[in-house]
């Protein structure tokens, strides 16, 4: 069979070889397509409900005014010329539709090096057959599941038109110290050969390199966190980061209802002030960072000072 590729919605003419150019003609077209069950016979004197889909022209050719997905299949013509010689024509028709230019939607303007990031979603609408989407970095194909690259794909079919919508979501983990402005693009490759790929406009997100965080230091005065009843304890949260982050305070793992401040003063210490304290620094560019914990405890007169309060871990200090 001769392979014919036709674009959806376009007309198609299939020649019936050996047919006399004008009536009377002894010919018959048989088709087995998505519109038929087994074979449907069309003759020159036909004409009727099938005319919207396929009809025999005066010269014996079969005319399809606007091919559709259901017209994919086999078309055969059997013709006899004036001398009684029989000729057969056999066609396999496949249809295609080129989608609109693919687009990258929900694209990221900034990526963070060293962690997985969603770059964007590539969308292609109105293809047949489905075809495929692929991603490119600086013009080179990106291979999923390699070097921190992952792709999530989805294919949907329109219930009425039968055309496909493809979606491909790209996730990447940029290497530290890599290209600060990588160029990503996406391309649609048709399911039928001989049609070139369609490529999106490129996107160029910035890659942000997170600065390794320095530890949040919690300084306690008096050192060791043990104080006589009625004494004062000063807790200072030191964060080297710029700009200065917001500092909140925790006691026994519960946030204290105080305005943000790098210094917490506990005057006139009483039994209710005993516990484990820490500070939490919240940066605009990364998540919250918690300091080590210190135990604040009360020492009765006669007890040895600094050794009575333990520092760090989850030490509860010495109870009076």
């Amino acid at each position: 069979a001769q392979n014919i590729t036709a674009r959806i919605g376009e007309p198609l003419v299939l020649k019936c070889k050996g047919a006399p150019k004008k009536p009377p003609q002894r010919l018959e077209w048989k088709l087995n397509t998505g519109r038929t069950e087994a074979w449907k016979v069309l003759s020159p004197q036909g004409g009727g409900p099938w005319d919207s889909v396929a009809r025999v022209l005066p010269n014996g050719s079969l005319f399809l005014p606007a091919v559709g997905i259901q017209d994919e299949g086999i078309f055969r013509c059997q013709a006899m010329n004036r001398n009684g010689k029989e000729t057969k024509s056999n066609y396999r028709v496949r249809v295609y539709q080129i989608p609109g230019k693919p687009e990258i939607v929900d694209s990221a303007s900034e990526l963070t090096a060293g962690v997985p990031n969603k770059v964007g979603t590539c969308v292609s609408e109105g293809s047949y057959p489905a075809g495929t989407l692929s991603w490119h970095l600086d013009g080179k194909p990106l291979v999923p599941n390699e070097k921190g690259v992952s792709v999530k794909e989805q294919t949907r079919r329109h219930p009425e038109t039968g055309l496909f919508t493809l979606q491909s979501e790209l996730m990447v983990t940029p290497a530290r110290g890599g290209d600060p402005r990588p160029t990503f693009s996406c391309s649609f490759s048709p399911g039928l050969p001989r049609h070139r790929a369609l490529r999106t406009a490129p996107i160029q997100p910035r890659v942000w390199e997170p600065v390794p965080l320095e530890e949040v230091q919690l300084v306690v005065e008096p050192e060791g966190g043990a104080v006589a009843p009625g004494g004062t304890v000063t807790l200072t949260c030191e964060v080297p980061a710029q700009p200065s982050p917001q500092i909140h305070w925790m006691k026994d793992g519960v946030p204290l209802p105080l305005p943000p401040s790098p210094v917490l003063i506990l005057p006139e210490i009483g039994p209710q002030d005993q516990g484990t304290y820490s500070c939490v620094a919240t940066h605009s560019s990364h998540g919250p960072q918690e300091s080590r914990a210190v135990s604040i405890s009360i020492i009765e007169p006669g007890e040895e000072g600094p050794t009575a309060g333990s520092v760090g871990g989850s030490g509860l200090g010495t109870l009076a």
Partner: antibody, heavy 119, light 107 residues
Framework: EVQLVESGGGLVQPGGSLRLSCAAS????????MTWVRQAPGKGLEWVAS????????YYPDSVKDRFTISRDNAKNSLYLQMNSLRAEDTAVYYC????????????WGQGTLVTVSS | DIQMTQSPSSLSASVGDRVTITCRAS??????VNWFQQKPGKAPRRLIY???NLADGVPSRFSGSRSGTDFTLTISSLQPEDFATYYC?????????FGGGTKVEIK
């Protein structure tokens, strides 16, 4: 609203003529073939005529061929049936319906208009 | 011309009954058969298209099937509003041919 509305029915003498109209609304008229179907009093349904979406091709059963003419005006979203040489057996309710080819066949109907051929 | 022989021409049934109406085509018409419902004084309404497909807005108790040139309309559980006349139509070839109709009446 998607609808078809027929008009033009009435009483006519045998041998006379009548023109039926069908006004379409709520859909893209020129995407569809259109068809006329009739129903004689107390009888079943009978196909009368079909026309393709461009109006270039028309189709009739032998019972009305050469007497009836189906036409359309896509600019006016209208379908017509010109009936000449009317006979008593043409007495029926005439329905206009959307479709007429293998893709869409009579999926939407008008309310019908009565044609009475009598002396 | 293709003949569509519809049977029975009438039937009496009760609400809740399963009802089956058959049309036999005189030659192969593929899947190109529709079923219609018509109530007195009203226009027909398409129920089933291309032998087996339920038209929009039609209750799921209606179904269509095909075996060769035999086409069947089934109402799984007859409802009061289903008492009407039913027609099949072949549209594989001209002239388009309707079956003679089946009147479904209350027993």
């Amino acid at each position: 609203e998607v609808q078809l509305v027929e008009s033009g029915g009435g009483l006519v003498q045998p041998g006379g003529s009548l023109r039926l109209s069908c006004a379409a609304s709520g859909f893209t008229f020129n995407n569809y073939w259109m068809t006329w179907v009739r129903q004689a009093p107390g009888k079943g349904l009978e196909w009368v005529a079909s026309i393709d979406n461009s109006g270039d091709n028309t189709y009739y059963p032998d019972s009305v061929k050469d007497r009836f003419t189906i036409s359309r005006d896509n600019a006016k979203n209208s379908l017509y049936l010109q009936m000449n040489s009317l006979r008593a057996e043409d007495t029926a309710v005439y329905y206009c319906a959307r479709g007429g080819d293998i893709r869409v066949m009579l999926d939407l109907w008008g309310q019908g208009t009565l044609v009475t051929v009598s002396s | 011309d293709i003949q569509m022989t519809q049977s029975p021409s009438s039937l009496s049934a009760s609400v809740g009954d399963r009802v089956t109406i058959t049309c036999r085509a005189s030659q192969d018409v593929g899947i190109y058969v529709n079923w219609f419902q018509q109530k007195p004084g009203k226009a027909p309404r398409r129920l089933i298209y291309r032998a087996t497909n339920l038209a929009d807005g039609v209750p799921s108790r209606f179904s269509g099937s095909r075996s060769g040139t035999d086409f069947t309309l089934t109402i799984s559980s007859l409802q009061p509003e289903d008492f009407a006349t039913y027609y099949c139509l072949e549209f594989d070839e001209h002239p388009l041919t309707f079956g003679g109709g089946t009147k479904v009446e209350i027993k």
